[in-house]
Every structure is written in C-alpha cells, then in structure tokens.
Interface confidence: low
Amino acid sequence: GLLDLKSMIEKVTGKNALTNYGFYGCYCGWGGRGTPKDGTDWCCWAHDHCYGRLEEKGCNIRTQSYKYRFAWGVVTCEPGPFCHVNLCACDRKLVYCLKRNLRSYNPQYQYFPNILCS
C-alpha cells in the first residue's frame, strides 16, 4: 500500500516521500496527464502504468500491503500473494528509477501545478 511505498522511497532515495515526490511534475502523486517533465516524472509515469496493469487484474493498489527487506541498498520483495508481490515489484522499480534520477531532480517541479500539464 501507500505506506509501504512511502517507506521504500525514503529508504532508497533518502528523501522525504511526500514533500519531495508527492506533488512532483505531472505524474508523481495522485493522477497524471500530459507529458512527463523529466526523468523523475517519467519514473512516476511508468509506475502509474505498472499500477494500472495490476488494477486491471483486480488488485487493490491503495490498500494491499506487502513485505519487503531492505539491506545494503537492495530492496527484496518477500514471497506472497500475486497482488502483494507484484505491487511490491512496481514500487521497487519506481524507487530504483527515482534513485537513478536523483541528480536531475529539479526543485522547480517539486510542487508543479497540474494545470500546466498538457
């Protein structure tokens, strides 16, 4: 669920999930439209699509939690039910993507107005 994602983002990127990524660009946080603004925003775009595929399969992406381990910078999704494991996999891809794009993180997009996304 969202709490799992929050903790995973913070462990991997070292940044506060809500303030740094909750409103970033056009796709980080709730909803999404238009063209992603940069690499970080593309990570969130891909994550939205990953979640979309799971929703199509009946997974409750907002509420279903999962178990993962974090050691030496590596996230490992624990075995479990289909929805939980695949939800963890979506989040794992996102956080690694966010970490790869930390250098290009642009504070100008941190609280980007959705109305400017087209």
Epitope: E55, E56, K57, G58, N60, R62, T63, Q64, P79, G80, P81, F82, C83, H84, V85
Partner: antibody, heavy 116, light 106 residues
Framework: QVQLQQSGPELVKPGASVKMSCKAS????????ITWVKQRTGQGLEWIGE????????YYDEKFKGKATLTADKSSNTAYMQLSSMTSEDSAVYFC?????????WGQGTTLTVSS | QIVLTQSPAIMSASPGEKVTISCSAS?????MYWYQQKPGSSPKPWIY???NLASGVPARFSGSGSGTSYSLTISSMEAEDAATYYC?????????FGAGTKLELK
Amino acid sequence: QVQLQQSGPELVKPGASVKMSCKASGYTFTDYVITWVKQRTGQGLEWIGEIYPGSGSTYYDEKFKGKATLTADKSSNTAYMQLSSMTSEDSAVYFCARWFPYFDYWGQGTTLTVSS
Amino acid sequence: QIVLTQSPAIMSASPGEKVTISCSASSSVSYMYWYQQKPGSSPKPWIYRTSNLASGVPARFSGSGSGTSYSLTISSMEAEDAATYYCQQYHSYPLTFGAGTKLELK
C-alpha cells in the same frame, strides 16, 4: 473462447493422495492467476489458494497449507492441485477459476470422494 | 481474516418483487464481488468491484455499498433469478466468501 476444463471424478482411499488438473484454453495462460475453490455438498465456497503460472508463485489459505499443493505446466497450459493425506473431510467438488478482475471463468468442477 | 456475513441465509420472493441481499464484512474492504450458483453448476460471476455487472447479467440486478456494508439488489424478481448468491472479498488474504444466500421463488 476462454475455457477451463477440469479432470474427471476421483474416488480415493483415506490416507491416499490425488492430483487433479485444470486445462486452460482461449487465453494467455501465463498472464492470469488461477485459483482453486472447495465446495462440500450443500455447503458454501472455500478459497484454497492461487497460483500465478507466469512465475509459478503460489499462495495458500493457512487451512490448506500441507494439504494442497498447486503447480502449473506452462507447456500444456494446465494447472494442477495435489491433495494429500485424504480424509472424509476432503470429499467435495473442487473448482479452478481464473481471476481477472474477478473469477470470470470457472471449470466445471472435479468431484472427489474419499471412501474406503 | 475478513469474515463475510450474508443475510438472510434463505429467502423467497414472488415474481416482480424487489429483493435485497446483504453482506457484512468484519473489517472494511475496498470492493465486494458477487457470484450466482445454481444446483449442479459452477458459480457464475455476477457483480464485480461492488457495482459492475458481469457480462450477460440482466440490468435488474445492481450492487452497492462501501466499507463493511454491501448489498445485491434485484429490482423485480424473475423465476430465473432463483439461485444461491455468494459475496466475496479480495481486499486481503485469505480471500473469503460469505456463506451464501439461497433465493427461492415464492
């Protein structure tokens, strides 16, 4: 069209094991979860567990851990359920069903009778 | 695990009558799913994600609810609606079903 064809009725002795099958057709087998459900005569539906054929990952209700083993053969598009250490409590109809995004297709059921 | 309690367990309705079957969850769930089963047959998907009718389900059926309280409604009972209806949750594991409501034609 999508079909789940289950194997025929089984009569087994107490203590024995049985393996039933669920052959899928009409869709990409590895893309959907297959779930198994138990229904005793005149009773309701009980979820046993699920398998995701794409990866082979499984999940079971605690009640059926050690009783049921779910497997899938991607080459034949077939899911299997093995039940071990049979007792009279295992006598039931067992259904396989596909999940997307609900149990949209069901097999016709396999009737299992445990009797000496 | 989440326990689903259906009520009533058995009911009968006359043709044209409005029917409501309830399903109460022991803790909050995101969606409820409903299946219809007739004797000697496999269950059929009936309503998914609380209010969406599965393919081929007549428009006289509807589903509603949120949190711990859900229901299936038939606006006008017909003979072919006589069956057992099960609610089911996929909110958390293990997946659970209600005990079923047997709907008979009066």
